[in-house]
Interface confidence: medium
């Protein structure tokens, strides 16, 4: 007759792990005992448990209430058992040695080998700010058994390094994104990508990337000279900028206050009827926590009734 | 030959406690699984707990959380720690032993102790 059994077992951490041992044997013989030992390089034999055709099912006291024998229906020729809830100690060589009429004693061996699936961290680095270098975005954590990898998913574009650390029972792997902040990565997703042998699908944390700036100010509202006449109504100017975070604005006159009647909302200032006490230098000041950009520009109100006598003077003139 | 000759057994009050020896005449190391039968008056012998020598115990569900067996090959001694005795449990307790056969056969050659006396009564 022969053994039959695995080379390596595999199982993930907390499951229950299955030792075959099946004795093929020729017609007539019959197994009287299996006995299960841990046999780890450099250290004696450790009984795990033996299964006795008289007896019964022995366990040793260090595995009592893991060790069992495969629900019914059983081979007499089947010395498999199982090892509940596996844990990373667990991780080793193992033997099964079976005694048979008439043919004697028969071993194999077998290498228990138990996943320790990651749970992975990410850590994003310091705040993101435009015209900073090359700078790290985020780091992914994650620790296992075997070593896990650790990539990244993203359309952004940046340089990624790794390192392992290795512990007594498994590996933990650190990989770092960097990348050149600029104003365009913002509300871009980066994705941290943990790969296991222990794990039914890839694990993905995602971090979603904000990169401080404050983009230049302009006015608008000034593209025609000719609208800003007195008596006109509705004239306003609108503060355009962007940035992260959305900035405040605030609006000043160079050569004074602003004059009465004058309303302030936000990016936007808003004048009552046109008079000549309107012209004047106008600032708008655009700030965040990062930066702070100025954008002025004059105001000259128009007489339309100084406009009309300078053409009459002219007509006559010609 | 190995003899096995068993000690401590007696009369006890149910809730009680007793520990059974059994001593080999030879080395008990190459025993393969040595253990605990008892037989009440008028009944079959039944299996009480039984040790391999790897220390591993297997034990009759009667007796599961109230006795512990155990051996001390240096010794040449199986023991069996009895707690919270009941009248049930009354009977001859032998000791036995079992060796494979050459080159580990399973012809197991089977030895047997003469029994001890335990009376769980108040």
């Known amino acids: 007759g022969e053994l039959e059994t695995s080379d390596v077992v595999t199982v993930v951490l907390g499951q229950d792990a299955k030792l075959p041992c099946f004795y093929r044997g020729d017609s007539g013989e019959q197994v009287g005992q299996v006995a299960w030992a841990r046999v780890d390089a450099g250290e004696g034999a450790q009984e795990l448990a033996l299964l006795h055709s008289k007896y019964g099912l022995h366990v040793s006291p260090a595995y009592e209430g893991r060790v069992e024998q495969p629900p019914p229906p059983r081979n007499p020729l089947d010395g498999s058992v199982l090892l509940r809830n596996a844990v990373q100690a667990d991780e080793g060589e193992y033997e099964c040695r079976v005694s048979t009429f008439p043919a004697g004693s028969f071993q194999a061996r077998l290498r228990l080998r138990v996943l320790v699936p990651p749970l992975p961290s990410l850590n994003p680095g310091p705040a993101l700010e435009e015209g900073q270098g090359l700078t790290l975005a985020a780091s992914c954590t994650a620790e296992g058994s075997p070593a896990p990898s650790v990539t990244w998913d993203t359309e952004v574009k940046g340089t990624t390094s790794s390192r392992s650390f290795k512990h007594s029972r498994s590996a933990a792997v650190t990989s770092e994104f960097h990348l050149v902040p600029s104003r365009s990565m913002n509300g871009q997703p980066l994705t941290c990508v943990v790969s296991h042998p222990g794990l039914l699908q890839d694990q993905r944390i995602t971090h979603i990337l904000h990169v401080s700036f404050l983009a230049e100010a302009s006015v608008r509202g000034l593209e025609d000279q000719n609208l800003w006449h007195i008596g006109r109504e509705g004239a306003m100017l609108k503060c355009l900028s962007e940035g992260q975070p959305p900035p405040s604005y605030n609006w000043t006159r160079l050569d004074g206050p602003l004059p009465s009647g004058v309303r302030v909302d936000g990016d936007t200032l808003g004048f009552p009827p046109l008079t000549t006490e309107h012209s004047g230098i106008y600032v708008c000041h655009v700030s965040n926590e990062f930066s702070s950009r100025d954008s002025q520009v004059t105001v000259d109100v128009l007489d339309p009734q100084e406009d009309s006598g300078k053409q009459v003077d002219l007509v006559s003139a010609s | 030959q190995v003899q096995l000759v068993e000690s401590g057994g007696g009369l006890v009050q149910p809730g009680g406690s007793l520990r059974l020896s059994c001593a080999a005449s030879g080395s008990i190391f190459s025993m393969n699984v040595m253990g605990w039968y008892r037989q009440a008056p008028g009944k079959q012998r039944e299996l009480v707990a039984t040790i391999t020598s790897g220390g591993s115990t297997n034990y009759a569900d009667s007796v599961k959380g109230r006795f512990t067996i155990s051996r001390d090959n240096a010794n040449n001694t199986v023991y069996l720690q009895m707690n919270s005795l009941k009248p049930e449990d009354t009977a001859v307790y032998y000791c036995?032993?079992?060796?494979?056969?050459?080159?580990?056969?399973?012809?197991?050659?089977?030895?047997w102790g003469q029994g001890t006396q335990v009376t769980v009564s108040s």
């Open positions: 036995t032993g079992d060796q494979l056969g050459p080159l580990g056969t399973f012809s197991p050659i089977v030895y």
